[in-house]
């Protein structure tokens, strides 16, 4: 390991999994790196080995238990530790005392669906996954759908400031085929991001009706 | 906006002990890393110890190792530097800083503060 930029930056998903990423510049592909987790209400210790993800960062998921238990509360703190081999020994590269409820990324939304789909509109619903009950309904979501000769980038972002699990598309295109992405984000936690977008759902409209204005 | 008031410094023998205090506002105290750093007369700012946010972890130049205890109060939004058996060379103005998240690197402790406060001088001399 070497003395190059580093960051550390992890995630709590509200349930069951802390994803955290190691980055140095300059430091070796091979280098050997694990975080270590040690709660300060908790039984468990938790170790997970940092897998090269890019050339110079590193990726790990602390697993606690069952995606859906509750294993962290909003009182937890978990220190996490990036440690790196140096010869017969680990150094301690990063630390953080991380409140899982301060550093909040839930899971991409799932279970994209068409409900209803016409001509000039399009409803589509989703569920959350592995998202805390803790939440209750203080979460907002993020939309867009990607046109015809347009990229995800340009695409304008619809956003939904309650738990509001589908979004009604106006103003398509007939016969027009698009695809739609969302996302999710508690309204809690300073460090709190937006989770990944799901995965697109496809969808076409219906063709305009042959002589009638639609 | 983020705040950071020193306070504790002044003139003391050799052998003595100081408390220095570092009272923070305008934001969330215990969701960031602090440090102490010094400037001696006439040298650059010089790291001496630094703190997770809520003091499970703590680090030490190797200068003040064994003599200077770093710790925090999150309830008093407050940040502690107990220095014992002082040396002339502890001569210098301290200052409370805070890092931009909540994560520190000891190998390059230095890395990463966003706001410091104004200082306190400590004198050390007979």
């Known amino acids: 390991a070497v003395n190059g930029t580093s960051q550390f930056t992890c995630f709590y998903n509200s349930r069951a999994n802390i994803s955290c990423v190691w980055s140095q510049d300059g430091a070796l592909q091979d280098t050997s790196c694990q975080v270590h987790a040690w709660p300060d209400r908790r039984r468990w210790n938790q170790t997970c080995e940092l897998l090269p993800v890019s050339q110079a960062s590193w990726a790990c998921n602390l697993i606690l238990g069952a995606p859906d238990s509750q294993k962290l509360t909003t009182v937890d703190i978990v220190t996490l530790r990036v440690l790196c081999r140096e010869g017969v020994r680990w150094r301690v590269m990063a630390i953080q005392d991380f409140k899982p409820f301060e550093n909040l990324r839930l899971m991409a939304p799932i279970s994209l669906q068409v409900v209803h789909v016409e001509t000039h509109r399009c409803n589509i619903s989703w569920e959350i996954s592995q998202a805390s009950h803790y939440f209750e309904r203080h979460l907002e979501f993020e939309a867009r759908t990607l046109s015809p000769g347009h990229t995800w980038e340009e695409a304008p972002l619809l956003t939904l400031k309650q738990k509001q699990e589908w979004i009604c598309l106006e103003t398509l295109t007939p016969d027009t085929q698009y695809e739609f992405q969302v996302r999710v984000k508690p309204l809690q936690g300073e460090f709190t991001t937006w989770s990944p977008w799901s995965q697109p759902l496809a969808f076409r409209t219906k063709p305009a009706a042959l002589g009638k204005d639609t | 906006q983020v705040q950071l008031v020193e306070s504790g410094g002044g003139l003391v023998q050799p052998g003595g002990s100081l408390e220095l205090s570092c009272a923070a506002s305008?934001?969330?105290?215990?969701?960031?890393?602090m440090s102490w750093v010094r400037q001696a007369p006439g040298k650059g700012l010089e790291w001496v110890s630094s703190?997770?946010?809520?003091?499970?972890?703590?680090d030490y130049a190797d200068s003040v190792k064994g003599r200077f205890t770093i710790s925090r109060d999150n309830d008093k939004n407050t940040l502690y530097l107990q220095m014992n058996s002082l040396k002339p060379e502890d001569t210098a103005v301290y200052y409370c800083a805070r890092y931009s998240s909540s994560t520190y690197y000891p190998p390059t402790p230095a890395r990463g503060r966003d706001y410091r406060g104004q200082g306190t001088q400590v004198t050390v001399s007979s």
């Open positions: 703190i997770t946010g809520f003091g499970r972890g703590t």
């Open positions: 305008g934001f969330t105290f215990s969701n960031y890393a």
